[in-house]
């Protein structure tokens, strides 16, 4: 049941944090204006990954896409595809953990099949949210970086003039959601992982009476009523008698039908 | 709106200098990016420099890069352009115009004319011997 649990939980988080994803991508606000010095304005400038946006006090609001521009850096390429591959790494980690699911039965799918699907995906979602935190926190280091650049050059001036700035650009709303739903899907991953544990069905269940002597399980030993139970002076399973009792070794070697209780 | 005047034009000889200014004035906190183009006799108007309010680094077009310098004094709502060691080929009508969107850091504003709002009327610029 908690099995069931943590995997459910773990897809539902996954779910909400790919969603961020995808809408922190296709957001407009990765960076606005700073209205430092400047708390009066007709007008408000942010930009996303795509597109630039201009909203005037009327409410009136124009976008315009990049591809008219003369260069676009390496870095802002960058962002894109890690968030791209965000995505898509989340899409199919949903796509394959829906069939994981314990709750949801599909043919005559083995339990060991479900855990190596859950596991699968639960790498997926940690590698998606991985790709969306760093993306994010590379276009935040880009801002930072451009912070302190120009508003060094508002003391300094740039080549031999004076270069002031009227406005600065700082955090948007998408870095936010994208850094708290990177989060997420990172935590879901974890969770698909854990679960994947409790789902993968161990193999010592069917073996353990006979290779072990350890524990409080007895084994039925046909011609005699002495059997060990791991305690006292025969904690080596060592040879009781020969009626039928055999060490660790030949049990391994030669399994009988009275070796599986 | 925005009106931008442009002065500082002139003739010079190869391997002189300039020094190109452009007063904004009107609604000028709609002037984020703002730019240097150039049209030469019989040619296209390309773009020479262009520089964005709030953003440090410049964007110099391969045949001016090293010669010609763009800066903004965003208090007087000015932008210069700067142009040393100028060739013939330098010669040209200079226009400023001024671009109310930004991009993010790298990005380089404006690029095309079509991007670009408010323009000025033009200051020529000779280079001759």
């Known amino acids: 049941m908690a099995v069931t649990a943590c995997q459910g939980l773990g897809f539902v988080v996954s779910l909400i944090g790919i969603a961020g994803i995808i809408a922190a991508t296709c957001m407009d606000q990765w960076s606005t204006q700073d209205l430092y010095n400047n708390p009066v304005t007709a007008v408000f400038n942010y930009q996303g990954l795509w597109r630039s946006c201009v909203r005037e006090s009327s409410g009136f609001t124009e976008c315009r896409g990049y591809f008219t521009l003369l260069g676009l850096p390496a870095m802002l390429q960058a962002v894109r595809a890690l968030m791209i591959v965000g995505i898509v790494l989340g899409a199919i980690g949903l796509l394959v953990s829906i069939f994981a699911l314990k709750c949801i039965r599909i043919g005559s799918m083995e339990d060991s099949a479900k855990a190596n699907m859950t596991l699968t995906s639960g790498i997926m979602f940690i590698v998606s949210g991985l790709c969306a935190i760093a993306g994010v926190s590379v276009f935040a280091n880009m801002l930072v970086t451009n912070f302190w650049m120009s508003t060094a050059n508002m003391y300094t001036g740039m080549g031999g003039m004076v270069q002031t700035v009227q406005t600065r650009y700082t955090f948007g709303a998408a870095l936010f959601v994208g850094w708290v739903a990177g989060g997420l899907t990172l935590i879901g991953g974890v969770m698909m992982c854990i679960a994947c544990r409790g789902l993968a069905p161990e193999e010592t269940n069917y073996k353990a009476v006979s290779y072990h002597a350890s524990g409080h399980s007895v084994a039925y030993k046909p011609g005699g009523f002495k059997a060990s139970t791991g305690f006292g002076s025969n904690t080596k399973n060592k040879k009781i008698y020969d009626g039928g009792a055999r060490t660790e070794d030949e049990v391994q070697s030669y399994p009988s039908k009275h070796d599986y209780v | 709106e925005v009106q931008l005047v442009e002065s500082g034009g002139g003739s010079v000889q190869p391997g002189g200098s300039l020094s190109l200014s452009c007063a904004a004035s009107g609604d000028t906190f709609r002037a984020k990016c703002m730019a240097w183009f150039r049209q030469g006799p019989g040619k296209e108007r390309e773009v020479v420099a262009t520089i964005q309010s709030g953003y440090y680094r410049p964007y110099y077009t391969d045949s001016v890069k090293g010669r010609f310098t763009i800066s903004q004094d965003a208090d007087k709502n000015r932008v210069y352009l700067q142009m040393d060691s100028l060739k013939p080929e330098d010669t040209a009508m200079y226009y400023c115009?001024?671009?109310?969107?930004?991009?993010?850091?790298?990005?380089?504003?404006?690029?095309?004319?079509?991007?670009?709002?408010?323009w000025g009327q033009g200051t020529r610029v000779t280079v001759s011997s």
């Open positions: 115009a001024a671009d109310r969107f930004t991009y993010p850091p790298g990005v380089i504003c404006g690029g095309i004319s079509e991007n670009y709002r408010y």
